[in-house]
Amino acid sequence: WELTILHTNDVHSRLEQTSEDSSKCVNASRCMGGVARLFTKVQQIRRAEPNVLLLDAGDQYQGTIWFTVYKGAEVAHFMNALRYDAMALGNHEFDNGVEGLIEPLLKEAKFPILSANIKAKGPLASQISGLYLPYKVLPVGDEVVGIVGYTSKETPFLSNPGTNLVFEDEITALQPEVDKLKTLNVNKIIALGHSGFEMDKLIAQKVRGVDVVVGGHSNTFLYTGNPPSKEVPAGKYPFIVTSDDGRKVPVVQAYAFGKYLGYLKIEFDERGNVISSHGNPILLNSSIPEDPSIKADINKWRIKLDNYSTQELGKTIVYLDGSSQSCRFRECNMGNLICDAMINNNLRHTDEMFWNHVSMCILNGGGIRSPIDERNNGTITWENLAAVLPFGGTFDLVQLKGSTLKKAFEHSVHRYGQSTGEFLQVGGIHVVYDLSRKPGDRVVKLDVLCTKCRVPSYDPLKMDEVYKVILPNFLANGGDGFQMIKDELLRHDSGDQDINVVSTYISKMKVIYPAVEGRIKFSHHHHHH
């Protein structure tokens, strides 16, 4: 018996087609993805093959203005239209709190939403009861297939699930649910979830009875043969893991942003054992036409986005200096504003010993693309912020050793004075540079804001300590020459859309007045260029 699994993960609000790098589509003939194009391909496969499931491994929420405006209603609407068969909860589904998940998505989805390792307690337990399930048995042709869901147990550090959801260890939580499915005589079981490729592989290895793992969170691209676009495969598709009980378990993921549709064919014997598995992600490029009816619906929903982007979010009473003359040479107040917003967006009081789990932010000055003039009645709009942050990136959470941070700050000024983008803006960090010293030895003071303290204060950076830092995904991926971050990071979790983070902060503060306040200093008077 053959099953076709179509799967997406980490779509992050890419409802419309995008450019090849998943940013805004400029030249339509070269654009990719989007729900209208995805629907065309899904329908084509559904018509051609008998036993097809369309699954999503989480993080539909967060990533473009679509989510900012529609807050998840767009996810329910278009996933319903595409007739998804099941979805696992990702960490970003909790970005607007539990209510922001329940009302727009859980109550409106016409498909089951799954997670076995999230347990509700207190008053939330009865409220959320039945709105997501640990597993779902799906009818496929004359057979049944069990789908068990899982979600990153780091979600309380990455999003806003509140205090009444407990995120258990994935493997511990999955095993009893799989065992239960086995007692119900369900002999074909897919683990569908959002904990990253390393955990996907562990689940394949450790959870007895799981036949296939369909994952997300780490944006992992797997491919067998010559890859069709820019993504470099992390391994073959499917990635085969030998389980502790000797079975070959296929593990798949489909990169991110709806650029690919994962396509996996599994052959089962009559006892539900996997005999063979093969496939590849399908690149959703312009050779696949956009479905006209879904496209028309997208265009209808788009109208509200255009209106939103010109509305006032808040006001500034000072000039927001995002000029390259400032932000690539010295502390600029636009950099301070953005870093303050990044930290504010990551406030999570999950431990009494810590005022927050993260206090530091770094931001490449080259990523700040425009100032905002306060002489327009102080008004700040989404449109203004899109000029400051035009690349459609995210502000991510990483863990780095102090020694890596030191290297990053040396890189920040290794060729100072040439107006290059690697000059770092900061938050929760005080740095002093001496430009009279040779490149690689210019950081003379680097103090960082404590987290395990009731009164935050600045302490010298410790080389062997592990620190959490919020930074643009561009830097986490080694952009602007920050190869040391990419090579040495100990953990990387994708965060919220950059513009959304800043816009939320401005809306919250109502009136802003960021200052230049001595976060970045130069000794020996080398701060004039």
Partner: nanobody, 126 residues
Framework: QVQLVESGGGLVQAGGSLRLSCAAS????????MGWFRQAPGKERVFVAA????????TYGDSVKGRFTISVDNAKNTLYLQMNSLKPEDTAVYYC???????????????????WGQGTQVTVSS
């Protein structure tokens, strides 16, 4: 909270009629299959009838065909089971069930249903 609440059960003479209702709340059911199952004392739970919430396609268990009619009122979010020509062997606790949506399904495999009511007792006396 997803809830299915049955009502309408009771004691009835053989040959009589009853109409069971099941009020569904807490989420959309528009791509769900809704079903009625029953369980007689000391017996397994068995399938009675099912209906697609949208479209209204139906299917019935062999023992009730021609006597029972399943229906939904979308506006009231309510499932019904009209039971005519009742027999003593129809005596059971009747459960309303629903799927969480997903693939098209119309049938009686109870493991494919995700939500269950508490049940309502139907007793048919001879």
């Amino acid at each position: 909270q997803v809830q299915l609440v049955e009502s309408g059960g009771g004691l009835v003479q053989a040959g009589g009629s009853l109409r069971l209702s099941c009020a569904a709340s807490g989420r959309t059911f528009s791509r769900s299959t809704m079903g009625w199952f029953r369980q007689a004392p000391g017996k397994e739970r068995v399938f009675v009838a099912a209906i697609r919430w949208i479209g209204g396609t139906t299917t019935y268990g062999d023992s009730v065909k021609g006597r029972f009619t399943i229906s939904v009122d979308n506006a009231k979010n309510t499932l019904y089971l009209q039971m005519n020509s009742l027999k003593p062997e129809d005596t059971a606790v009747y459960y309303c069930a629903a799927t969480a949506g997903g693939p098209y399904y119309l049938g009686g495999r109870d493991i494919l249903y995700d939500y269950w009511g508490q049940g309502t007792q139907v007793t048919v006396s001879s």
